[in-house]
């Protein structure tokens, strides 16, 4: 491991469509990938009228959008499906939404997912 960088070896796994996709619903996912590349964790969720619905969580392959992010934070303004990624084992257990707005002050909506 390179000093100062969290190496990701496993992530929290969740799949809302586990029956259709023929996977487990929840668990811990070991992260595989080319040895020369970085690995990350991700979380995706929807905000349905203020209610958080997790779509998927798991491992994510080498992506500069995720480099050196210890927390899983979505910064896009009002996406249809929220997505965040991070580095470090199980870093996708918690995820947040901090939209980067140009003029107004950013609002914080931290989310601690509860298993269904």
């Amino acid at each position: 491991a390179i000093l100062g960088r969290s190496e990701t070896q496993e992530c929290l796994f969740f799949n809302a469509n586990w029956e259709r996709d023929r996977t487990n619903q929840t668990g811990v996912e070991p992260c595989y990938g080319d040895k020369d590349k970085r690995r990350h964790c991700f979380a995706t969720w929807k905000n349905i009228s203020g209610s958080i619905e997790i779509v998927k969580q798991g491992c994510w392959l080498d992506d500069i959008n995720c480099y050196d992010r210890t927390d899983c934070i979505e910064k896009k303004d009002s996406p249809e499906v929220y997505f965040c990624c991070c580095e470090g084992n199980m870093c996708n257990e918690k995820f947040s939404y901090f939209p980067e707005m140009e003029v107004t002050q950013p609002t914080s909506n931290p989310v601690t997912p509860k298993p269904p």
Epitope: Y32, K37, W60, D62, I64, N65, E80
Partner: antibody, heavy 115, light 111 residues
Framework: QVQLVQSGAEVKKPGSSVKVSCKAS????????INWVRQAPGQGLEWMGT????????SYAQKFQGRVTITADTSTSTAYMELSSLRSEDTAVYYC????????WGQGTLVTVSS | QSALTQPRSVSGSPGQSVTISCTGT?????????VNWYQQHPGKAPKLMIY???KRPRGVPDRFSGSKSGNTASLTISGLQAEDEADYYC???????????FGGGTKLTVL
């Protein structure tokens, strides 16, 4: 091993649409982006757009905005690129590639637009 | 994003070294370590040779190396071999908040 297998060659009339598929295997489809790139005969590579298969979020090159639609079906590990209002200049080989680094590529799909 | 600028062609004899340049702007090549290099033989799909300016994927010979200075990235091929004759493209990372762009390509001829 990682493989991206694309659909076969297509011949299309000007003004019509084409939909090219890219089936991924050998890795978890929901763990990276799929990018689409095209190459006209004797020309260079041209980036068309990308999709995050997990969120469905897409980004398109300005040149193709409004004419290209990239989708992904996680249940079959397949990405699709649909290009509409075809013209002769769209005759090209269309490639899908895995991840932001384009580390694995499909074999390419030749789309010929001719009246 | 405008295309990255590459020389149309370069050439070298077997055993020699050649360098292919890829010039962008301070907002793309100059700002980030996200330039990649691809090799394409006629009628084949491109192959990733260098990513993140200087990282080499598994299976790529160490004769291929990448570097960057200012707004220009470079691919150096040392100990040139006949099979290195191909088109080479530079390109950027694409995904999330990053949009992709490629150079126009450089034809490498091994004399």
């Amino acid at each position: 091993q990682v493989q991206l297998v694309q659909s076969g060659a297509e011949v299309k009339k000007p003004g019509s649409s084409v939909k090219v598929s890219c089936k991924a295997s050998g890795y978890k489809f929901t763990s990276s982006y799929i990018n689409w790139v095209r190459q006209a005969p004797g020309q260079g590579l041209e980036w068309m757009g990308t999709i995050n298969p997990v969120s469905g979020s897409t980004s398109y090159a300005q040149k193709f905005q409004g004419r290209v639609t990239i989708t992904a079906d996680t249940s079959t590990s397949t990405a699709y690129m649909e290009l509409s209002s075809l013209r002769s200049e769209d005759t090209a080989v269309y490639y899908c590639a895995r991840g932001g680094w384009f580390d694995y590529w499909g074999q390419g799909t030749l789309v010929t637009v001719s009246s | 994003q405008s295309a990255l600028t590459q020389p149309r062609s370069v050439s070298g004899s077997p055993g020699q070294s050649v360098t292919i340049s890829c010039t962008g702007t301070s907002s793309d090549v100059g700002s980030y370590n996200y330039v990649n290099w691809y090799q394409q033989h006629p009628g084949k799909a491109p192959k990733l040779m260098i990513y993140g300016v200087s990282k080499r994927p598994r299976g790529v010979p160490d004769r291929f190396s990448g570097s960057k200075s200012g707004n220009t990235a470079s691919l150096t091929i040392s100990g040139l071999q006949a099979e290195d004759e191909a088109d080479y493209y530079c390109g950027t990372f694409a995904g999330g908040s990053y949009y992709g762009v490629f150079g126009g390509g450089t034809k490498l001829t091994v004399l």
